[in-house]
């Protein structure tokens, strides 16, 4: 059976053993061999069964006496075989042994759970000799107990080429119970049940858990460890933590916060980056994600104008980097831009509107119905035109921008001419006689030179011609028009 | 299936004493506090306390200590309210419950009318 | 202790009418439970924990609310559903009942 001592237990005496005299008294060690230096507490296990030595790992020597007796076979004494004490306490335990003289160079190691304890270990040998035999003892100790040195402890002897094994001794460390899953925090969709686990260990076992929930026990009787608690499902934040209970009294978790999923807060700081004439540049700060992860944003932009029919322009992006260029906008126009992010649950509210402008552009179409003729008695090229929409002028048109290219017998000449805003015709020098003259008109505003009209050419004669009509711009279809005068 | 089966009515004089008995199966017994509660006669209920049947222990609400005892016999998986000095308003029918987690009283007992009359 | 308090103590209604019963808490609570009573027969649970439905019982009952103020709700009345219903909080002990609701027939 297994021997079992409990901290309150009396230390036992250093060593009971079957050698005469007392060890206090006549029985000074000889040697003493320290593994380790260290406090030796007062609470020491020892051998209680000296007599009987154990059955288990016996060497039996070969050599015999004088008188031919062969000698006992060697085993380590019984001892105690189970010790219970409280984590942070010190012990002391011990195997014993009497090993006959002729013997020579035997050490003790220590296992536990069939590893060799090696380094620092407060492991101490003692030896006692006598006229035949030599008593040894190998004693261990533990100055606090932690949970970790739980486990089971055996002596090794090497003698005569076998190994002598002595039986285990089994610490058993107890304290208050010790997490190995706590709850953790959690975001969560309201009024939706989810799952939360706390398992706590001995020794002692068991260990019972309680739930707490907003400093409110869930369970009024205990639950064996793991628990696992379903929430039925929450309204508002709440702080769940868990006890676990054992022998030795109570140990509570880690309290964690469980948030509810809502829609995020509107973004804030909505910026202007970057303008051009079609297109802004904006950034804004994300407001606060609701405990859900931002999916998408939303930028809504409408025309600052009072006369605009109040339509609203969206455009949807990801809602990183938190930075959008909106594109597609009307030159030299003012905007109400406004942003929204969304998570799981739904769309925030619109981030405070911001006023932005874009600047002037180029003109995006070229003026209209160019018609050339040739003004031969002042030997002139007269070319009109129409101005381009309003709204496609991207700007206040500050002129325009001709260009006339002069083609003869191989011989190609581009000339460029600017001309105010306010007219819609224009007179050029001929150039060149018995030449092409093909003509192109462009708007011009601050913010650049729109596109140049569809070429529209013109034949100048010799000298001497008389007939003579105007060119103009092709109708539709009709790819490069000459007109020969 | 979940089961609470209580004991009959009682008549009893004033100053006698009543044992209501509550037998609980289909659950391990152990693991959850049966509750007691209180229906005077046309009024509603009222919760009397219940008793942890892991640890025996038993907590009474206000109104409810002295004279009402809980007690369980776990080997037959029972719990008892005893009301001793009776009185005649302590006429009423009195229930048996299971307490789940968050104090629901999941499941009941059919009831057992207690009349305190001379 | 929290006192729980139903209104409106009686409410009259015809069948297939919605009902709508209320319990207010003296203080926060974490969740309400409700039982329904009738005449003889013990409480039966009904809505667990302010919003679940206990087993076996229809989907036109419902049960909503947070903090202090909580409500049941009968979608469309049938005959079998005149009863007295009470409110039961959960957050501290002593565990208190509301003072009931009695739903008859109009």
């Known amino acids: 059976a297994i021997t079992e001592a409990r901290e309150e237990a009396k230390p036992y005496p250093l060593f009971p053993g079957p050698f005469p005299g007392s060890l206090q008294t006549d029985h000074t060690p000889l040697l003493s061999l320290p593994h380790a230096s260290g406090y030796q507490p007062a609470l020491m296990f020892s051998p209680t069964q000296p007599g009987r030595p154990h059955t288990g790992n016996v060497a039996i020597p070969q050599v015999t006496s004088v008188e031919s007796k062969p000698l006992p076979p060697l085993a380590f004494k019984h001892t105690v075989g189970h010790i219970i004490l409280s984590e942070h306490k010190g012990v002391k335990f011990n195997c014993s042994i009497s090993v006959p003289n002729i013997y020579q160079d035997t050490t003790i190691s220590w296992w536990k759970d069939g590893k060799e304890l090696l380094g620092a270990h407060h492991a101490i040998t003692q030896f006692y000799p006598d006229d035949e035999v030599t008593a040894i003892i190998a004693s261990f100790s533990i100055t606090s107990v932690q949970r970790s040195d739980n486990g089971s402890y055996i002596c090794k002897m090497k003698i005569n080429n076998e190994e002598i094994v002595s039986d285990p001794i089994y610490i058993e460390v107890q304290g208050l119970p010790h997490f190995t899953k706590q709850p953790e925090s959690m975001n969560v969709t309201r009024n939706t049940a989810f799952n939360l686990t706390c398992q706590a260990v001995g020794p002692p076992e068991p260990v019972n858990i309680f739930w707490v929930q907003n400093s409110s026990r869930v369970n009024e009787q205990p639950e064996k460890s793991p628990s696992v608690l379903t929430v039925p499902g929450l309204t508002e934040m709440a702080v769940f933590s868990c006890e676990a209970h054992n022998d030795k009294g109570l140990t509570v978790s880690k309290g964690v916060q469980i948030n509810i999923k809502a829609i995020p807060s509107p973004p804030t700081e909505v910026s202007i980056r970057n303008s051009t004439a079609h297109s802004i540049l904006i950034s804004w700060v994300p407001g606060f994600d609701g405990y859900s992860p931002f999916r998408n944003c939303s930028i809504q932009v409408k025309e600052a104008d009072p006369l605009s029919n109040g339509s609203v322009m969206i455009f949807n992006t990801s809602a990183l980097p938190h930075l959008y260029q909106i594109k597609q906008l009307q030159a030299l126009a003012n905007y109400s831009i406004g942003v929204s992010c969304m998570n799981e649950i739904g769309w925030s509210a619109v981030s405070p509107w911001i006023l932005a402008s874009t600047t002037e552009g180029a003109p995006s179409v070229a003026p209209l119905n160019v018609t050339v003729f040739l003004n031969e008695s002042s030997d002139n090229v007269d070319i009109r035109w129409m101005k381009p929409p309003t709204k496609q002028q991207d700007g206040e048109l500050v002129g325009y921008r001709i260009s006339h290219v002069w083609q003869s017998a191989g011989i190609s000449k581009e000339l460029l001419e600017e001309v105010g805003q306010n007219g819609s015709r224009a007179r050029i020098s001929v150039q060149v006689h018995n030449a092409t003259c093909t003509v192109r008109i462009a708007a011009v505003t601050r913010g650049g030179v729109g596109p140049f009209s569809d070429p529209v050419k013109i034949f100048i004669p010799a000298h001497g011609w008389v007939d003579y009509a105007p060119s103009s711009t092709p109708a539709p279809g009709n790819a490069d028009p000459v007109l020969i005068i | 299936q979940v089961q609470l089966v209580q004991s009959g009515s009682e008549l009893k004089k004033p100053g006698a004493s009543v044992k209501v008995s509550c037998k609980a199966s289909g659950y391990t017994f152990a693991n959850y506090g049966v509750h007691w509660v209180r229906q005077a006669p046309g009024q509603g209920l009222e919760w009397m306390g219940w008793i942890n049947t892991y640890q025996g222990e038993p907590t009474y609400a206000q109104g409810f200590t002295g004279r009402f005892v809980f007690s369980l016999d776990t080997s037959v998986s029972t719990a008892y309210l005893q009301i001793s000095s009776l009185k005649a308003e302590d006429t009423a029918v009195y229930y048996c419950?299971?307490?789940?987690?968050?104090?629901?009283?999941?499941?009941w007992g059919q009831g057992t009318l207690v009349t305190v009359s001379s | 202790e929290i006192v729980l308090t139903q209104s409106p103590a009686t409410l009259s209604l015809s069948p297939g009418e919605r009902a709508t019963l209320s319990c207010r808490a003296s203080s926060s609570v974490g969740y309400m439970h409700w039982y329904q009573q009738k005449p003889g027969q013990a409480p039966r649970p009904l809505i667990y924990a302010t919003s679940n439905l206990a087993s076996g019982i229809p989907a036109r009952f419902s049960g909503s609310g947070s903090g202090t103020s909580y409500t049941l709700t009968i979608s469309s009345l049938e005959p079998e559903d005149f009863a007295v219903y009470y409110c039961?909080?959960?957050?501290?002990?002593?565990?208190?009942f509301g003072g009931g609701t009695k739903v008859e027939i109009k």
């Open positions: 039961q909080q959960w957050s501290s002990n002593p565990r208190t």
């Open positions: 419950t299971r307490g789940a987690r968050y104090a629901y009283m999941d499941y």
